[in-house]
Interface confidence: medium
């Protein structure tokens, strides 16, 4: 697998690998259109979770505000559905016992925002 | 910073840390509603990039299909805007010289999908 050495190489001691300090493109930032979460026809709110032993320590989750979508009159139209858009992302967990620090990758599912879709089934009035 | 040890601990040799093999929740998968990229009022297409020295090796980028949004008649309405939803994510880069393998984190901007928004009005003089 990705984290294993070639078969011809000696095995990794203690089941760990070397992680270089420093993050490539660390200062790269999302530059999205302003306030899209409130201007969207499928608006959403954000919840922030914070964990000092995780990198990034802040993970932001979106929750769709409505079941339907917002029409041109600003009213909810339940003939359309607001649905979450999800993304798998990696975070790094820090584990420490005294001066011994190691890291482990963790896969996290993040809801990034919402989009308005035509429904698969109309089962609601 | 996140990757530093407490001050009282000896420095890390060679600017690297221990990365445990194995990923927490590795088999966790995005489970989004079906075909939302084509059912959305702001539909999008996907481009896949593949790099064997990156984990995950596959990174999927979305591109909005239209500038406007799709109305109930299936036509593009340019009084509304399709905008990308972006997310910062981490990937792991593998660097190897012979049997010496190390890893480095890299921040990547991923466009996850698109949403339909009311435009910001730019008043032109």
């Amino acid at each position: 697998t990705f984290f294993q050495k070639p078969e011809s190489c000696p095995p990794v001691p203690g089941g760990s690998m070397k992680l270089d300090i420093g993050i490539i493109n660390e200062n790269q930032r999302v530059s999205m259109s302003r306030n899209i979460e409130s201007r969207s026809t499928s608006p959403w709110d954000y919840t922030v979770t914070w964990d000092p032993n995780r990198y990034p320590s802040e993970v932001v989750q979106a929750q769709c505000r409505n079941l339907g979508c917002i029409n041109a009159q600003g009213k909810e139209d339940i003939s359309m559905n607001s649905v979450p858009i999800q993304q798998e992302t990696l975070v790094v967990r820090r584990k420490h016992q005294g001066c011994s620090v190691s890291f482990q990758l963790e896969k996290v599912l993040v809801t990034v925002g919402c989009t308005c879709v035509t429904p698969v089934i109309h089962h609601v009035q | 910073t996140f990757f530093q040890k407490p001050e009282s601990c000896p420095p890390v040799p060679g600017g690297s840390m221990k990365l445990d093999i194995g990923i927490i929740n590795e088999n966790q998968r995005v489970s989004m509603s079906r075909n939302i990229e084509s059912r959305s009022t702001s539909p999008w297409d996907y481009t896949v990039t593949w790099d064997p020295n990156r984990y995950p090796s596959e990174v999927v980028q979305a591109q909005c299909r239209n500038l406007g949004c799709i109305n109930a008649q299936g036509k593009e309405d340019i009084s509304m805007n399709s905008v990308p939803i972006q997310q910062e994510t981490l990937v792991v880069r593998r660097k190897h010289q012979g049997c010496s393998v190390s890893f480095q984190l890299e921040k990547v901007l991923v466009t996850v999908g698109c949403t339909c928004v009311t435009p910001v009005i730019h008043h032109v003089q």
């Epitope: 709110d45 919840t47 989750q61 929750q63 769709c64 505000r65 409505n66 079941l67 339907g68 909810e76 339940i78 559905n81 607001s82 649905v83 979450p84 879709v117 429904p119 698969v120 089934i121 089962h123 609601v124 | 489970s31 989004m32 509603s33 079906r34």
Partner: nanobody, 123 residues
């Protein structure tokens, strides 16, 4: 591991009321759309009511509209269904579940259900 425990069902006369509760563990109800569903004998499971992720935005199947009210208690991680003006055709086992895609969630997308709570309306 998500667990859903429905309660509050029973035998009631036509026109009567019941309040169903669903205790959820392993899932914060405040972060998900939640729904009630029902299954009558020899029938498919059907959607009854939904409440959105944020606040109290709720939606109902046409056959319960105006009679049933869905609500949530985030502090207790519980979802309720207040059932008034009950009719014999409301007789069914009632289930609650999260609705990960809101109203776009399909019955065949569920992996887990609770045991449900039986509601019987007698005339």
């Amino acid at each position: 591991q998500v667990q859903l425990v429905e309660s509050g069902g029973g035998l009631v006369q036509v026109g009567g009321s019941l309040r169903l509760s669903c205790e959820v563990s392993g899932l914060p109800v405040s972060s998900y759309a939640m729904g009630w569903f029902r299954q009558a004998p020899e029938k498919e499971r059907e959607f009854v009511a939904a409440i959105s992720w944020i606040g109290g935005d709720s939606r109902y199947a046409h056959f319960v509209k105006g009679r049933f009210t869905i609500s949530r208690d985030n502090a207790k991680n519980t979802v309720h269904l207040q059932m008034d003006s009950l009719k014999p055709e409301d007789t069914a086992v009632y289930y609650c579940n999260d609705m990960p895609y809101g109203l776009d969630t399909r019955m065949d997308e569920y992996e887990y259900w609770g045991l449900g709570t039986q509601v019987t309306v007698s005339s």
